[in-house]
Interface confidence: medium
């Protein structure tokens, strides 16, 4: 598994999101139905505190394509 170090902010956060989500694209805040802490966005979750790639994945726009 990947091992996170510290926090992700700014260009570093966008870079990592782009890589994790690829051509799926991503949201900076997830739809309310996909998260229990409704007010939190990715900046709060990953820039204000450390996060992992599994959490970043939840901000990807659509599920991975099969083709």
């Amino acid at each position: 598994a990947y091992r996170p170090s510290e926090t992700l902010c700014g260009g570093e956060l966008v870079d990592t999101l782009q890589f994790v989500c690829g051509d799926r694209g991503f949201y900076f805040s997830r739809p309310a139905s996909r998260v229990s802490r409704r007010s939190r966005g990715i900046v709060e979750e990953c820039c204000f505190r450390s996060c992992d790639l599994a959490l970043l994945e939840t901000y990807c726009a659509t599920p991975a394509k099969s083709e």
């Epitope: 598994a1 990947y2 091992r3 996170p4 170090s5 510290e6 992700l8 570093e12 870079d15 990592t16 890589f19 994790v20 690829g22 051509d23 790639l53 599994a54 994945e57 991975a64 394509k65 099969s66 083709e67």
Partner: antibody, heavy 117, light 111 residues
């Protein structure tokens, strides 16, 4: 054009250490994840370790976890692999590769690491 | 560990068409694209096909790739002696964020 040049390989005894370097040029280094891929003599390719653009996340194959450390110095456009507690089975050509989302689009020429007493 | 399965060797005569198969699972090929690399003797791997069927500039159109389900294949038409090399397929693990390779296939051009 993209160029990746590895160095630091050589002969080392079991239990010893080596530090590999990969000097990158011809592209914006900070825009890419980078990896080390190795190939044991007569064998196939094996992903050893990967690192995100700014070094925030690192991946290690189970076979090297706890012994190898990947890092990068974006100010020097250089990727590193610190290898400790080396074993005979670590003997391989180590390639530095540039990651795209789905593949490796550029490779270095490789540096040979031989672990033997 | 070798995650993707390839035949150890294939062969063909000059001018012929050969295919190399690559079998994976739903967590790699089934949900990600496949790439192929050519490794000539004594050299570093070279990207041959990416995103299942795209060729980087400079790669002849004799090389083509395809994917169906959890398997992929590389086809080489008009086989030439300089095509003799090792060929590796590669994909990505969907939620592990790492890349997986096949064991490699040695292509021998006969005659």
């Amino acid at each position: 054009q993209v160029e990746l040049v590895e160095s630091g390989g050589g002969l080392v005894q079991p239990g010893g250490s080596l530090r590999l370097s990969c000097a990158a040029s011809g592209f914006t280094f900070t825009s890419y994840w980078m990896s080390w891929v190795r190939q044991a003599p007569g064998k196939g390719l094996e992903l050893v370790s990967s690192i995100t653009s700014y070094g925030s996340f690192t991946y290690y194959a189970d076979s090297v976890k706890g012994r190898f450390t990947i890092s990068r110095d974006n100010s020097k456009n250089t990727l590193y692999l610190q290898m400790n507690s080396l074993r005979a089975e670590d003997t391989a050509v180590y390639y530095c590769a540039r990651n795209m989302y789905t593949h490796f689009d550029s490779w270095g020429q490789g540096t040979l690491v031989t672990v033997s007493s | 560990d070798i995650v993707l399965t390839q035949p150890p060797s294939v062969s063909g005569a000059p001018g012929q068409r050969v295919t190399i198969s690559c079998s994976g699972s739903s967590s790699n090929i089934g949900s990600n694209s496949v790439s192929w690399y050519q490794q000539l003797p004594g050299t570093a791997p070279k990207l041959l096909i990416y995103d299942n069927s795209k060729r980087p500039s400079g790669v002849p159109d004799r090389f083509s790739g395809s994917k169906s389900g959890t398997s992929a294949s590389l086809a080489i038409t008009g086989l030439q002696s300089e095509d003799e090399a090792d060929y590796y397929c590669q994909s990505r693990d969907t939620y592990g964020y790492y890349w997986v390779f096949g064991g490699g296939t040695k292509l021998t051009v006969l005659g």
